[in-house]
Interface confidence: medium
């Protein structure tokens, strides 16, 4: 008996069906398979969990989180013994092993490994102004997503004709920051942060509108 | 694997109307930022119109040439982008691509492109 | 209307270095991009934001953009970078992007 190489992993958007690829070739009827999927969660590396098994010609469940999400993706018994994961959750993030057993057949390799990553869009960023919005002030804008794997990225536009920031500012895409160093007059206006990664972008709006002095009345 | 697949191409006649979907699948299509480009046959590439997701306001912009004649619209619940053509004009005979703007908002490149649909407009 | 020039061709031999041009109005005060287009084949987006590369593009490919004119640099050029490349300036709140003619590069 021999399981098939199984690509590394599979990336799946939380929410979305993944299918685990497990195939082998054997020399026996299948007439006693038997099929066990496991998964070392990436949140609980200690704990292995059974996510399905095939014996004796029956499915049986594995733990309780994967009820009524998880199947076969064919008719069983076969040689093709890939599962399906309906409504990818975050924890479903892990290592998943397909053990196969095909009596009499024994020796060769009987293990299958995949590893599973559930990815999930930036949530709304928040978009806040820090400092003073005074004349000559130096400001930072902030944007920041709560939920993004894999980590989102975060880029700053200004709404206006050219999209590009004044040439007194940084950005930093990884903290999602832009320092604006002597604002001006010229530094007003609309800001937009665009929080993405593999799977999505999510935006926020700001508006920076810098304040003059007001003359002083003699 | 983030993907888009077009279809709905086809030959019409002038004056005719076409709608053209675009299937969304690898990404979570609602948050996207969606975009039609078209290319006549050899000749190089003209952006269509986009549509806003509905968080962003779901507003659409338009070429001129196509401006009152299509419209641009998305469900996100079947992950799927449309382009409805009317008043069709020789002119509009091209391939017909569905892309996601990717790596920022408006100054963010398009990033996949769909496989291309063929409308051609012919009497 | 905004235009955007590109020359029609350019040539280079393999392992050198191929620079495509993009010129417009005060280009560099907006964003470029770069479209790979091989015969038969949906355009590939190669530079985005004046500079960027999105995953998966070479590192022989960078770009560059300031004045009237942004620039798509192909470094050790090989037989497979042949196609068809369009530049294209980012448009704005209220207006769509502009693509170049398209230049085809030719690897000798």
């Known amino acids: 008996l021999e399981v098939s190489e199984s690509p590394g992993s599979v990336q799946v958007a939380r929410g979305q069906t993944a299918v685990l690829p497990c195939a082998f070739s054997t020399s026996a009827a299948l007439l006693n398979l038997n099929v066990i999927w496991m998964v070392i969660p990436l949140s609980n590396a200690n704990q292995p969990e059974q996510v399905i098994l095939y014996q004796g010609g029956q499915m049986f469940d594995g733990a309780l989180r994967f009820h009524g999400r998880v199947g076969f993706t064919g008719t069983m018994p076969a040689t093709n013994v890939s599962i399906f994961i309906n409504n990818t959750q975050l924890s479903d993030t892990g290592t998943y092993q397909c053990l196969v057993n095909n009596l009499p057949d024994r020796g060769g390799r009987n293990i299958g490994v995949t590893g599973l990553t559930v990815l999930v869009p930036p949530s709304a960023p928040q978009c806040q102004i820090q400092g003073s919005q005074d004349l000559g002030s130096d400001v930072i804008l902030l944007c920041s997503s709560e939920e993004g794997i894999p980590r989102p990225t975060y880029l700053w536009e200004k709404l206006d004709n050219t999209l590009k920031l004044p040439p007194t500012a940084t950005q930093d895409q990884v903290q999602g920051t832009v320092t604006i160093r002597n604002i001006s007059a010229l530094s007003s206006g609309l800001y937009q942060c665009v929080a993405s990664n593999a799977i999505g972008t999510s935006t926020c709006l700001l508006d920076l509108q810098v304040i003059s002095p007001q003359p002083r009345s003699v | 694997e983030v993907q888009l697949v077009e279809s709905g191409g086809g030959l019409v006649k002038p004056g005719g109307s076409l709608r053209l979907s675009c299937a969304a699948s690898?990404?979570?299509?609602?948050?996207?930022?969606m975009s039609w480009v078209r290319q006549a046959p050899g000749k190089g590439l003209e952006w269509v119109g986009r549509?806003?997701?509905?968080?962003?306001?779901?507003?659409?912009d338009y070429a001129a040439p196509v401006k009152g004649r299509f419209t641009i619209s998305r469900d996100d619940s079947k992950n799927t982008l449309y382009l409805q053509m009317n008043s069709l004009k020789t002119e509009d005979t091209a391939v017909y691509y569905c892309?996601?703007?990717?790596?920022?908002?408006?100054?963010?490149?398009?990033?996949?492109w769909g496989q291309g649909t063929l409308v051609t407009v012919s009497s | 209307s905004y235009e955007l020039t590109q020359p029609p061709s350019v040539s280079v031999s393999p392992g050198q270095t191929a620079s495509i041009t993009c010129s417009g109005d005060k280009l560099g005060d907006k964003y470029a991009s770069w479209y790979q287009q091989k015969p038969g084949q949906s355009p590939v987006l190669v530079i985005y934001?004046?500079?960027k590369r999105p995953s998966g593009i070479p590192e022989r490919f960078s770009g560059s953009n300031s004045g009237n004119t942004a620039t798509l640099t192909i470094s050790g050029t090989q037989a497979e970078d042949e196609a068809d490349y369009y530049c294209?300036?980012?448009?704005?709140?209220?207006?769509?992007?502009?693509f170049g003619g398209g230049t085809k590069l030719t690897v000798l």
């Open positions: 934001q004046d500079s």
């Open positions: 892309a996601r703007v990717a790596h920022g908002g408006y100054s963010g490149g398009l990033d996949p």
């Open positions: 690898g990404f979570t299509f609602s948050n996207a930022w």
């Open positions: 294209s300036s980012t448009g704005t709140a209220h207006t769509l992007a502009v």
């Open positions: 549509i806003k997701s509905k968080t962003d306001g779901g507003t659409t």
